[in-house]
């Protein structure tokens, strides 16, 4: 989280972001919020981005006003109209790009006074893991998939009842380039696993960390996934 | 769950101030505007002003200027609004309302002017 | 002041019909328009903000559009319950200034 406040006393406004993940190819959030003004036509909204010459976006008098956008933003961006009354200026980013990461300045001019604040934006691919059993192999053997994950991650296998072991002399990871030749898809082999057990295959870059769980028991199979954004820190 | 609780009806002689409260709760009180709004008889909504708790900035409307002050007790998430010199027009029901878009309203207070 | 001019005062019609309300502004707000619903001995409830954003909860029937100094509120399927009367309202520019209100009754 960065609190960031306007420079001349009471002509300040606090103005906060949240430094956040994007998944290349899907659709974005650069957080930012403000002290709300009571009417639109004093509120003006400017984000920017270090190293960009252009405007990332700017709303002013109650529209959007993008003569000054940057050509790499060029019908990407969006705020949430509906709520820059009540404080809210983040930004939707549309196909997020391996390029829209960086410093990113949120700007806030209100009847009360201006403030900004910074933002770091990463961007990468991450996608949540399945761990099926693979009754192909020769011997009890578990498959953890994921589609897309960008930068290369690393794979860590898991066992509840083996806790602490070493899985990576037991487990073979590849990567596989995805036809857009940035992304990369994420196939885990785990082999010798016992029935009554849970596993757990844990993929992990940079920009996230998702967790798949396979508990196989001899009259059943439960799955579970979830995935979390790193370094998601407010400012 | 967002509550907005007026105080009491009140009738008042002309000539006589009013003090209207407007307890929150469910929410941060401190970082949304609390609006004031009122409504005559069989009319329809005027404007008052609003104050911004967090730092105490004040918006009124011209028309109510001098004559009305809001005010909040941030540690009992309280608004209110007191007018004075009442006459007769004022007759009205008053509203709390939360935030630029008036997302919620009290359940408003009647003030009766009346000799 | 910016006038809201809504229109009509009042109206009646059937269960099911598409009902209009106009609200038209003596300068240009932008977008910066919302919509409530007021029944009778209630308080308002906000049901449009931004001229087309329906507030949270509030049925898809109702609908708003317009900019610059037209605006239209709309419920495609006038159902029992939505007897009330209905407000527009600018917050572009203080003084916040509401429409004088349309009383919408079921034939």
């Known amino acids: 989280l960065i609190i960031g406040f306007g420079i001349s006393g009471r002509h300040s406004i606090t103005v906060t972001t949240v430094a956040s993940a994007g998944n290349i190819g899907e659709d974005g959030i650069l957080s930012c919020t403000f002290e709300p003004d009571i009417k639109l036509s004093d509120i003006v909204i400017q984000w920017l981005k270090e190293g960009v010459l252009g405007l990332v976006h700017e709303f002013k008098e109650g529209k959007d006003e993008l003569s000054e956008q940057d050509e790499m933003f060029r019908g990407r961006t969006a705020v949430f109209a509906d709520q820059v009354i009540v404080g809210n200026a983040s930004l939707r980013l549309k196909n997020v790009q391996l390029t829209d990461a960086g410093t990113y300045k949120c700007y806030i001019i209100t009847s009360k006074g201006k403030g900004n604040a910074n933002l770091e934006y990463k961007t990468g691919a991450f996608s949540m893991p399945e761990v099926n059993v693979d009754y192909n192999a020769s011997s009890e053997t578990l498959r953890c998939e994921a589609p897309r994950w960008f930068p290369q991650p690393t794979v860590v296998w898991a066992s509840q009842v083996d806790q602490g072991a070493n899985f990576s002399e037991v487990s073979n990871t590849s990567f596989e380039l995805n036809s857009e030749n940035v992304t990369m898809k994420v196939v885990s082999v785990l082999y010798n696993v016992t029935i009554n057990n849970t596993y757990s295959c844990m993929i992990e870059n940079d920009i996230a960390k998702a967790t798949g769980d396979i508990k196989v028991t001899e009259s059943e199979i439960k799955r579970r996934s979830h995935l979390q954004l790193l370094n998601s820190k407010a400012s | 769950e967002v509550q907005l609780v007026q105080s009491g009806a009140e009738v008042k002689k002309p000539g006589a101030s009013v003090k209207v409260s407007c307890k929150a709760s469910?929410?941060?009180?401190?970082?949304?505007?609390m609006n004031w709004v009122r409504q005559a008889p069989g009319q329809g909504l005027e404007w008052m002003g609003g104050?911004?708790?967090?730092?105490?900035?004040?918006e009124y409307n011209e028309k109510f200027k001098g004559r009305v002050t809001l005010t909040v007790d941030t540690s009992a998430s309280t608004a209110y609004m007191e007018l004075s010199s009442l006459r007769s027009e004022d007759t009205a029901v008053y509203y709390c309302?939360?935030?630029?878009?008036?997302?919620?309203w009290g359940q408003g207070t009647l003030v009766t002017v009346s000799s | 002041d910016i006038v809201m001019t809504q229109s009509p005062s009042s109206l009646s019609a059937s269960v099911g019909d598409r009902v209009t309300i106009t609200c038209k502004a003596s300068q240009d707000v932008r977008t910066a328009v919302a919509w409530y619903q007021q029944k009778p001995g209630k308080s308002p409830k906000l049901l449009i903000s931004s001229t087309s954003y329906r507030y949270t909860g509030v049925p898809s029937r109702f609908s708003g559009s317009g900019s610059g100094t037209d605006f239209t509120f709309t419920i495609s399927s006038l159902q029992p319950e939505d007897i009330a009367t209905y407000y527009c309202q600018q917050h572009y520019s203080t003084p916040l200034t509401f429409g004088g209100g349309t009383k919408v009754e079921i034939k």
């Open positions: 469910g929410y941060t009180f401190t970082s949304s505007w």
């Open positions: 309302a939360r935030d630029s878009r008036f997302s919620y």
């Open positions: 104050i911004y708790p967090n730092r105490g900035n004040i």
